[in-house]
């Protein structure tokens, strides 16, 4: 399977909400012994590899924000902790999964990574990530709403091992 990032750049004004999205593509094994661990974290482009460093999002780690379920099942993060931080991650039946961030500030700017790990018999078998940039703008040049920029076809299917 692969992870696609429909948008590579989100440009938002302060105070707005945004939903960053990734999509699971390709054949997904729906066997009983297969589960998917999906999560989000912040990172940097890095001098070596994008998404190799895992930084928290609003002080919540990738463990705090993870979804753990089989195949294309729907799921949501545990509400209390994430919602106290203005965050919610979710996954639908079609392989889309997302993180919603409320009341954005400049401090939310940076690179965001989604990570999918396929787990068979309790062992990590395959992991892929996708990356996207969030720019939260202040001042007179800030847009009135979030503007999203589609990934190039090459970028949108990120199959780099995390």
């Amino acid at each position: 399977f692969k992870v696609a990032t429909p948008y590579s750049l989100y440009v938002c004004p302060e105070g707005q909400n945004v939903t960053l999205t990734c999509r699971l593509l390709g054949p997904v094994d729906k066997g009983h012994d297969v589960t998917f661990y999906k999560t989000w974290y912040r990172s940097s482009r890095g001098e070596v590899q994008t998404c190799s460093e895992r930084r928290p999002i609003r002080n919540l780690t990738f463990q705090d924000l993870h979804l753990h379920h089989g195949g294309h099942q729907a799921a949501n993060t545990s509400h209390d902790l994430a919602q106290r931080h203005g965050l919610e991650s979710a996954s639908d039946h079609h392989g889309n999964f997302s993180i919603t961030m409320r009341n954005l500030t400049l401090l939310d700017s940076g690179l965001y990574c989604c990570l999918v790990v396929e787990i068979r018999h309790h062992h990590s078998e395959h992991r892929v990530h996708g990356a996207m940039e969030l720019q939260v703008q202040t001042g007179k040049d800030a847009p009135s709403n979030c503007v999203v920029y589609p990934s190039s076809s090459q970028d949108s299917e990120n199959i780099t091992a995390a």
Epitope: R42, S44, G46, R58, H85, Q135, G139
Partner: antibody, heavy 121, light 111 residues
């Protein structure tokens, strides 16, 4: 080891533009961090002016927004400050500095040595 | 703008004693549990040097004689025991809201 070095004219006439260059060695400005300009006035007051992020996104101090532009040349690993319509109030030591960007902590961890700029006719 | 009020403006301390510098922000500098408050030292003719970030984290290479504390709007920098090399200006700085702002500075001298 990452190092930053400011360069530019030490004397600028009122109403003209001030242009400074920060040359970064030991780290690519497109890899991570935000790259800032900060100035220190006579009497020691420090003022943050603005930054350009590793991805090229700029944020400016609202008080300077109408006069400031920060740009970069990634091939030379340099970033630049342009301040238009200067007055004697812009006389200061100008520093470029790196700050952590896109994480839980935001702070200036590497500074250039500074360059003194006097605005005078 | 968040106004950073530093006190005292100058401080004379005997070698080996404790120096305490305070900084008050005009509004909270908390960001989801992190205090976005820094402390810098500056010696004459040199740029500021980071000492403490996020209120209490000591920057790598900085002696553990330097301690930062506080949350919300009230912060302090403690230096103990004070050494001759600590003679400098000290600045607090917030990065919670643009424009990022600095305190007016505290000049540390030896008695």
């Amino acid at each position: 080891e990452v190092q930053l070095q400011e360069s530019g004219p030490g004397l600028v006439k009122p109403s003209q533009s001030l242009s400074l260059t920060c040359t970064v060695t030991g780290y690519s400005i497109t890899s991570d961090y935000a790259w800032n300009w900060i100035r220190q006035f006579p009497g020691n007051r420090l003022e943050w002016m603005g930054f350009i992020s590793y991805s090229g996104f700029t944020t400016y101090s609202p008080s300077l927004e109408s006069r400031i532009s920060i740009t970069r040349d990634t091939s030379k690993n340099q970033f630049f400050l342009q301040l238009i319509s200067v007055t004697t109030e812009d006389t200061a030591t100008y520093y470029c500095a790196r700050n952590h960007y896109g994480g839980s902590y935001w702070y200036f961890d590497v500074w250039g040595a500074g360059t003194s700029v006097t605005v005078s006719s | 703008d968040i106004v950073m009020t530093q006190s005292p403006g100058s401080l004379a301390v005997s070698l080996g004693q404790r120096a305490t510098i305070s900084c008050r922000a005009s509004e909270s500098v908390e960001y989801y549990g992190t205090s976005l408050m820094q402390w810098y030292l500056q010696k004459p003719g040199q740029p500021p040097k980071l000492l403490i970030y996020a209120a209490s984290n000591v920057e790598s290479g900085v002696p553990d004689r330097f301690r930062g504390s506080g949350s919300g709007t009230d912060f302090s920098l403690n230096i103990h025991p004070v050494e001759e090399d600590d003679i400098a200006m000290y600045f607090c700085q917030q990065s919670r809201k643009v424009p990022w702002t600095f305190g007016g500075g505290t000049k540390l001298e030896i008695k």
